[in-house]
């Protein structure tokens, strides 16, 4: 066959779906690779063709669209499974072509099993809730397009293994789950099971997400530098190792980039000739407030180094702060015999 623009296997779109549930999968060509949509392609006389390679096989084969009850079907640029089976796992290819044009992309589809606590190999989206912030909601994800608005599905919510009912601060409200006041104890996996009828059949959609309760913007502050501070003086003799920790606390801020850096005499360590190393460690509180420690280390400090200005800087979306370390050269203690001799006026 003639040349085809092959975008290869799009592993960025590792699609996971649950066994025995409907799945609608859009051809990635129109989402990520081509500058036109399916309608434009269709009206220009292009045809969308689907085929697949089974798991652990090399042979590409056409998808069987003649299964009982139309278990697999195509509608515009969507491949439908009603429902999936475990052995549907494999690499799927959608190809757009006519006599003069051809473009195709493959993507992996994994059909996974879940247990009765909704545990599975599925990668879970994370939804962050602010601690003690008033009413917040999560919505049952990725259910759009499965049934028309005229259908009234049933929705059951679970936390871990348990159906949510009579929970103190968590209230199921259809597709939404409301948290009256989010607490650390609300951390966990939440599952919605959506059940709906279609053409005389009944289908379930199971969606699990992880809820993480994080620091509230109401309590957020600019970075706080705990070290260096005015109480600690780094007093060294030439030849000793100089270690100065910079420890900074950052309040949790959604999508904020937290940064810590040292300057030596106003320059970044990379821009000066001193043999300096910086090691960073990061720890998080239960509400994802962050503590970053950057330890500045000079193995054999010189008297010149001890005269320099060492400043720790920190920045977040809440602001920027800086603090200088107090560094000085240790004055060598006079030798004991000399001191005594001087005291007695000896020559």
């Amino acid at each position: 066959s003639e040349r085809c623009d092959d975008w290869g296997l799009d592993t960025m779109r590792q699609i996971q779906v649950f066994e025995d549930e409907p799945a609608r999968i859009k051809c990635p060509l129109f989402e990520h690779f081509l500058k036109f949509n399916y309608s434009t392609a269709h009206s220009a006389g292009l045809t969308l063709i689907w085929y697949w390679t089974r798991q652990d096989r090399d042979l590409e084969e056409p998808i069987n669209f003649r299964l009982p009850e139309n278990r697999i079907s195509k509608e515009k640029d969507v491949l439908w499974f009603r429902p999936t089976l475990l052995n549907d796992t494999g690499n799927y290819t959608c190809m757009l072509r006519n006599t003069t044009y051809c473009s195709k992309v493959a993507f992996p589809l994994e059909v996974v099993q879940k247990d009765s606590c909704f545990n599975s190999p599925m990668k879970l989206p994370v939804h962050k809730l602010y601690i003690e912030y008033g009413i917040q909601r999560i919505t049952c994800p990725n259910v759009d397009g499965y049934f028309p608005s005229s259908v009234k599905p049933t929705i059951t919510w679970y936390m871990g293994c348990y159906k949510i009912q009579n929970f103190n601060n968590v209230i199921p409200e259809g597709m939404n789950l409301s948290f009256l006041i989010a607490l650390i104890s609300n951390n966990g996996n939440y599952t919605c099971v959506v059940t709906y009828p279609e053409n005389g059949r009944t289908f379930h959609l199971t969606r699990t997400l992880t809820v993480k309760v994080v620091g509230s913007p109401k309590n957020a502050v600019p970075p706080v530098i705990h070290s260096p501070n005015d109480h600690v003086v780094y007093e060294k003799e030439p030849g000793e190792e100089l270690l100065i920790p910079c420890t900074v606390y950052f309040s949790f801020l959604m999508d904020s980039r937290n940064e810590v850096w040292w300057t030596i005499d106003g320059k970044k360590p990379d821009d000066i000739t001193i043999d300096v190393t910086i090691n960073e460690s990061i720890s998080h509180s239960r509400t994802e407030d962050e503590t970053r420690t950057q330890i500045l280390s000079i193995k054999k400090v010189t008297s010149e180094d001890l005269k320099r200005s060492y400043v720790c800087h920190a920045r977040s979306a809440k602001g920027e702060v800086a603090k200088a370390a107090k560094v000085k050269q240790k004055v060598p203690a006079p030798r004991y015999t000399v001191e005594l001799a001087c005291g007695f006026g000896a020559t």
């Epitope: 099993q113 247990d115 009765s116 599905p153 293994c161 348990y162 009579n166 099971v193 059940t195």
Partner: antibody, heavy 117, light 107 residues
Framework: QVKLHQSGAELAKPGASVKMSCKAS????????IHWVKQRPGQGLEWIGY????????EYNQKFTDKATLSADKSSSTAYMQLSSLTSEDSAVYYC??????????WGQGTLVTVSA | NIVMTQSPKSMSMSVGERVTLSCKAS??????VSWFQQKPDQSPKLLIY???NRYTGVPDRFTGSGSATDFTLTISTVQAEDLADYHC?????????FGGGTKLEIK
């Protein structure tokens, strides 16, 4: 296809115990909760409780907490219900039911328990 | 516990007639009501879930409606094979509870 096959009828004396089984086939046993429902002759249905085979957790109707014990054996895809200290009030048909998303969609054929001196 | 009350206890209808069965909950159960059909010497079968959704394979002569505390199962044109007991149940909050049932007889 999904099937729940329940053990045969039981005739028991007052004060005795019985343990009935519900063997699942046609699906992954570990993926669904199993509920138990009681039906006295000519009467309505009564929910006893459920067992979650993954966690082993069972939730009971308070009325049955001292009467029924629910369990499951994943290796044989079988759910069990034990009834203790039997009285004539326990004479009934007992059903196991597979549930998902609040749908009591698949029922066993029932186990008849008769308590008689 | 939520009490589910069904009415009437029994009714006798002719083939082709319209049948309306009632189920009332003692508290608001939203849409979390299911209807079950139980033919003589058989297990119950799910007919309706979520108050109004027909389960797989259920003929469209069966229609569920209602919300909160008042629910109805309607058989638009009753057939001889519809002879059965009909149970409603709330699947809203533990303990799940069922009505006493309505026995439908065919004249």
């Amino acid at each position: 296809q999904v099937k729940l096959h329940q053990s045969g009828a039981e005739l028991a004396k007052p004060g005795a115990s019985v343990k009935m089984s519900c063997k699942a086939s046609g699906y992954t046993f570990n993926s669904y909760w199993i509920h138990w429902v009681k039906q006295r002759p000519g009467q309505g249905l009564e929910w006893i409780g459920y067992n979650n085979p993954t966690s082993g957790y069972s939730e009971y109707n308070q009325k049955f907490t001292d009467k029924a014990t629910l369990s499951a054996d994943k290796s044989s895809s079988t759910a069990y219900m034990q009834l203790s200290s039997l009285t004539s009030e326990d004479s009934a048909v007992y059903y196991c039911v597979r549930e998902y998303g609040d749908l009591f969609a698949y029922w066993g054929q029932g186990t008849l328990v008769t308590v008689s001196a | 516990n939520i009490v589910m009350t069904q009415s009437p206890k029994s009714m006798s209808m002719s083939v082709g007639e319209r049948v309306t069965l009632s189920c009332k909950a003692s508290e608001n159960v939203g849409y979390s009501v299911s209807w079950f059909q139980q033919k003589p010497d058989q297990s119950p079968k799910l007919l309706i879930y979520g108050a109004s959704n027909r389960y797989t394979g259920v003929p469209d002569r069966f229609t569920g409606s209602g919300s909160a505390t008042d629910f109805t199962l309607t058989i638009s044109t009753v057939q001889a094979e519809d002879l059965a007991d009909y149970h409603c149940g709330q699947i809203y909050i533990y303990p799940y509870t069922f009505g006493g049932g309505t026995k439908l007889e065919i004249k």
